[in-house]
């Protein structure tokens, strides 16, 4: 026959003001019978918590039901703590008896009336910017005591300086939260990088509670379109091609006109991304010159994360392409580009046929 | 000290009904499960039921699950058990008995209530 | 469901000597790393007594020459030495389900 080990996993608890506490305590046996007592304190003074046996203990409530058979979870919880609940709760077991004797007790646990702060939350704009403007992160943490609290941001390591915090409320209180709201001025190079809002607190030890929030979350860097023709084929088709390069976040639909017509749509997927985080894709259209008698007029529309449609236009002058093998070719780009260009060098394309 | 306090003894003509109590004290009477328990004169021990006072879960054997009903009252620590239909071969003393160790035993016992089913 | 049979039905042993009291389950009553048998003592005009629980753990303020014994569907009840006060029947009670009782054992004095 096993003997029977009162445990209380948790040497100590913390728990603010107001909120319940939970006091676990198992035993590792249903032999002897007998109820489960807790007390704070030890010796002769010691304070009865609560009895399975008898009693009233209106703030108490067993986290397991007594009844059930097999039940060996002698865990309390007590509501609303105050300060004066702080002390060693002790899980004893008494053998069934007149009266019942006690058996053992657990080792205690430590119940402190003083809160950690919550994990602390960073959230980002509802909707996405582009470079240069300036979004806002806010961060949140909650149920801590006492109110001295020192909170920072940082962007990829960097701290920043341009935030504001409040720590409410700003009276007394059995606990307090915490609100930081930090500008941060986005970069076309910001896809990876990311904002951390850094929590300390007296409870924490030195080591401080950190929530994070990526900038891919909150950047839109719109795409580079840029519309060219291959060589003319042996077969009097011309390869058009449309590239849309340094795109995030990576939803985006390019739809091909024929002088204003639908030709195809595609939409990006499963692409590979640029060492910044962007996106770059390539598509082409075979133009059957031989088909035409006029210029064909060829759009490339690209509507990038619901915004609206950029377009590039490109004129494929049929005059220009004689019905014979190996002619020349001669084209016209009317496109224009929506935004400036820094050209780079890390280019991944796509190709769909 | 645990104490389980039954009425008093019952004369029934068949075709009634009884109500026997058993008033509890000395511990928390939601905690602890009341089992019902009946000997006919000469015989040995019949299980009849049991009921958990806290939320008024019950377990009838099969036998008595159509004629038993168990009830507790917990605002006066006192748990029923009524038997309908009273035949003669229901004469018994009938016994509550508290499950301390909620083993699905009986620790403690009332002293027992005599119920006498005659025409 | 499962049925508890007692052996013998009644007994007469000397005080001092020995008394053995068996009870054997239609199927077994063994569940959760416990054996859900007991033990109960009726003396005439008394309800019954727990005396062991869970096979082989004595109640409190039982005195230790009660002993249980067994596992799965046999179990035995021992008195090592008989006493007048022993006189009574005996009955095992399982909980494995829900409970049933033995027929009882009537123990008297050789």
């Known amino acids: 026959e096993e003997e029977l080990q009162v445990i209380q996993p948790e040497k100590s608890v913390s728990v603010a003001a107001g909120e319940s506490a939970t006091l676990n305590c198992t035993a590792t046996s249903l032999i002897p019978v007998g109820p489960i007592q807790w007390f704070r304190g030890v010796g002769p003074g010691r304070e009865l918590i609560y009895s399975q046996k008898e009693g009233h203990f209106p703030r108490v409530t067993p986290v397991s039901d007594p009844t059930k058979r097999n039940n060996m979870d002698f865990s309390i919880r007590i509501s609303n703590i105050t300060p004066a609940d702080a002390g060693t709760y002790y899980c004893v077991k008494f053998r069934k008896g007149s009266p019942d004797v006690e058996l053992k007790s657990g080792a205690g646990t430590e119940l402190s009336v003083r809160a950690k702060p919550s994990a602390p939350v960073v959230s980002g704009p509802a909707v996405r910017a582009t470079a240069e403007h300036t979004v806002s992160f806010t961060c949140e943490s909650h149920g801590f005591s006492p109110r001295d609290i020192t909170l920072k941001w940082f962007k990829n390591g960097n701290e920043l300086s341009d935030f504001q915090t409040n720590v409410d409320p700003a009276g007394k209180s059995v606990s307090y939260s915490i609100r930081s709201t930090a500008r941060v001025v986005l970069t076309r190079r910001d896809v990876h990088s990311q904002v951390i809002c850094e929590v300390a607190h007296v409870t924490l030890q030195g080591d401080p509670l950190r929530g994070t929030a990526n900038l891919s979350e909150a950047i839109r860097v719109p795409p580079f379109l840029e519309v060219t023709q291959q060589s003319m084929r042996a077969d009097n088709q011309v390869n058009v091609t449309c590239q849309v390069t340094k795109f995030y976040p990576q939803r985006l639909q390019l739809t091909w006109l024929e002088n204003g017509n639908v030709s195809r749509t595609e939409m990006a997927s499963a692409l590979p991304e640029n060492k910044d985080g962007t996106y770059n894709w390539t598509s082409w259209l075979l133009v059957n010159v031989s088909a035409h008698r006029d210029d064909v007029k060829l759009t490339c529309q690209v509507e990038h994360d619901g915004q609206p449609a950029v377009n590039k236009s490109f004129s494929v002058k049929v005059s220009a392409h004689p019905k014979e093998q190996g002619s020349n070719t001669a084209a016209e780009n009317t496109g224009t580009n929506e935004r400036d260009y820094k050209d780079d060098d890390d280019k991944h394309h796509h190709h769909h046929h | 000290q645990v104490q389980l306090v039954q009425s008093g003894a019952e004369v029934k003509k068949p075709g009634a009904s009884v109500k026997v109590s058993c008033k509890a004290s000395g511990y928390t009477f939601t905690n602890y499960w009341i089992n019902w328990v009946r000997q006919a004169p000469g015989q040995g021990l019949e299980w009849i039921a049991m009921i958990d006072p806290s939320d008024s879960e019950t377990h009838y054997n099969q036998i008595f699950k159509d004629r038993a009903t168990l009830t507790t009252d917990t605002s006066t620590s006192t748990a029923y058990m009524e038997l309908r239909s009273l035949r003669s071969d229901d004469t018994a003393v009938y016994y509550c008995a508290m499950d301390y160790g909620s083993l699905y035993a009986m620790d403690y016992w009332g002293r027992g209530t005599l119920v006498t089913v005659s025409s | 469901d499962i049925v508890l049979t007692q052996s013998p039905d009644s007994l007469a042993v000397s005080l001092g000597e020995r008394a053995t009291i068996n009870c054997r389950a239609s199927?077994?009553?063994?569940?959760?790393?416990?054996?859900?048998l007991f033990w109960y003592q009726q003396k005439p005009g008394q309800p019954p007594k727990l005396l062991i629980y869970?096979?082989?753990n004595r109640d409190s303020g039982v005195p230790d020459r009660f002993s249980g014994s067994g596992s799965g569907t046999d179990f035995t009840l021992t008195i090592s030495s008989l006493q007048a006060e022993d006189v009574a029947v005996y009955y095992c009670q399982h909980s494995r389900e829900l409970p049933t009782f033995g027929q009882g054992t009537k123990l008297e004095i050789k």
């Open positions: 869970l096979a082989s």
């Open positions: 199927k077994s009553v063994g569940s959760s790393g416990y054996n859900w």
